[in-house]
Amino acid sequence: AESCTSRPHITVVEGEPFYLKHCSCSLAHEIETTTKSWYKSSGSQEHVELNPRSSSRIALHDCVLEFWPVELNDTGSYFFQMKNYTQKWKLNVIRRNKHSCFTERQVTSKIVEVKKFFQITCENSYYQTLVNSTSLYKNCKKLLLENNKNPTIKKNAEFEDQGYYSCVHFLHHNGKLFNITKTFNITIVEDRSNIVPVLLGPKLNHVAVELGKNVRLNCSALLNEEDVIYWMFGEENGSDPNIHEEKEMRIMTPEGKWHASKVLRIENIGESNLNVLYNCTVASTGGTDTKSFILVRKADMADIPGHVFTR
């Protein structure tokens, strides 16, 4: 069932079918005998009760006041009254733009990130049974889509998808043809969720070690889900049996990004492990960033300024 019209202020375009549905509909069915009345007031006119004799364009069904179609002079306040229940709406009917397939003031704006899922479905549940066909237009040019009952676009957004999409439903009522237009202004923007990944700590790290002992080099980064973090060392990774890349640890930050940490474990440090670069790289769609670690014998510490050491 179509949900009730809960918005107190409504703007509609002249010449289109329109309806108001009150929000105590289920209750009204229970109290069939209760008197239910619709009223309109505009300007100097106080509450005027509405009925099909008021206008050939107005129809009343159970919970609904229908306009076939709504016109400029329908602007005003509308009331539904039943026992001690009252609901009020303020209706503003605006002029149709004769030079376009849609009226700018009746456009719903949506922002879609590039490459994210983008969907437009043309459906109108209230008038569904009366709709003969539906067309979807982009910037007022008809799109040729397979389904002419409920035309749909489902895709990953591209910048070229930006524009005004108008769903136009064509329907018959009492031998007359009407149309209802719903327009979306789709703006495609850059992926706002991605950050530039950041390797934490200094870019060059000298680590004081003792021969025969073990060392753990920790590489940490703030990154996106798709970004990768890895160690590069020697001619070909894996040639040194004493070097082990530990499993990456990831923790999600409150902002939805990731704090990643990857440890390189070097066991039984030998001369061949000294004074060579162990590079940790983070790679993203934006590029790469690298920080380097150099193992230095503790005895040689005096040759290097203290501030470049890490533990």
């Epitope: 850059e190 991605n194 790679a283 769609t285 934006g286 590029g287 960033d289 690298t290």
Partner: antibody, heavy 115, light 113 residues
Framework: QVQLVQSGAEVKKPGASVKVSCKAS????????ISWVRQAPGQGLEWMGW????????NYAQKLQGRVTMTTDTSTSTAYMELRSLRSDDTAVYYC????????WGRGTLVTVSS | DIVMTQSPDSLAVSLGERATINCKSS????????????LAWYQQKPGQPPKLLIY???TRESGVPDRFSGSGSGTDFTLTISSLQAEDVAVYYC?????????FGQGTKLEIK
């Protein structure tokens, strides 16, 4: 329109250098790295290297190390690839491409190395 | 360095029939931290730059017809064209973007039988 526009074809003598430009438009230049890919006549695609537009970090294919330099100018959203000490087997179409899966490509720049 | 190997080198398929191209990487391009495969597929027609078809091994680029699909994980991947059309005649490349140097397969030439 989102695009990468490359500079025109070049004819060079062996030993010379060539600098190809790639101008990005309608997207945030620093969001994506720029890769350079070349294709010799009738051959497959060869990745040459890439540059991070946000920090200028580069990563070059081993075989081109020392001969290639990639740079960017963020003020004009332009990437450059310079190849030095040209040889006849450097004759190829040189493409710039965006990101790490290449969703946007330039039209290509033909560089002919001939004496 | 990761080496990408495609098979077959060339392929002839009748219009409307299924075409399958395989790609094998010398080491896994599956990143265990996010369970993503860092593999893309491209189509290249004569005189044109390559066009991205598939990324993350199976995500179709927007605007690419749904007859193109990608599958596989780790080291073995497949590009499938479910019903070959005349405009699909081209060379197809796989590419890994898991580790630099990023590398392409040697290409598979697809023709109509």
């Amino acid at each position: 329109q989102v695009q990468l526009v490359q500079s025109g074809a070049e004819v060079k003598k062996p030993g010379a250098s060539v600098k190809v430009s790639c101008k990005a438009s309608d997207y945030t230049f620093t969001t994506y790295g720029i890769s350079w890919v070349r294709q010799a006549p009738g051959q497959g695609l060869e990745w040459m290297g890439w540059i991070s537009a946000y920090n200028g970090n580069t990563n070059y294919a081993q075989k081109l190390q020392g001969r290639v330099t990639m740079t960017t100018d963020t003020s004009t959203s332009t990437a450059y690839m310079e190849l030095r000490s040209l040889r006849s087997d450097d004759t190829a179409v040189y493409y710039c491409a965006r990101g790490w899966y290449f969703d946007l490509w330039g039209r290509g720049t033909l560089v002919t190395v001939s004496s | 360095d990761i080496v990408m190997t495609q098979s077959p080198d060339s392929l002839a398929v009748s219009l409307g029939e299924r075409a399958t191209i395989n790609c094998k990487s010398s080491q896994s391009v599956l990143y265990s931290s996010n369970n993503k495969n860092y593999l893309a597929w491209y189509q290249q027609k004569p005189g044109q730059p390559p066009k991205l078809l598939i990324y993350w091994a199976s995500t179709r680029e927007s605007g690419v017809p749904d007859r193109f699909s990608g599958s596989g994980s780790g080291t073995d991947f497949t590009l499938t064209i479910s019903s070959l059309q005349a405009e699909d005649v081209a060379v197809y490349y796989c590419q890994q973007y898991y580790r630099t140097p990023y590398s392409f397969g040697q290409g598979t030439k697809l023709e109509i039988k």
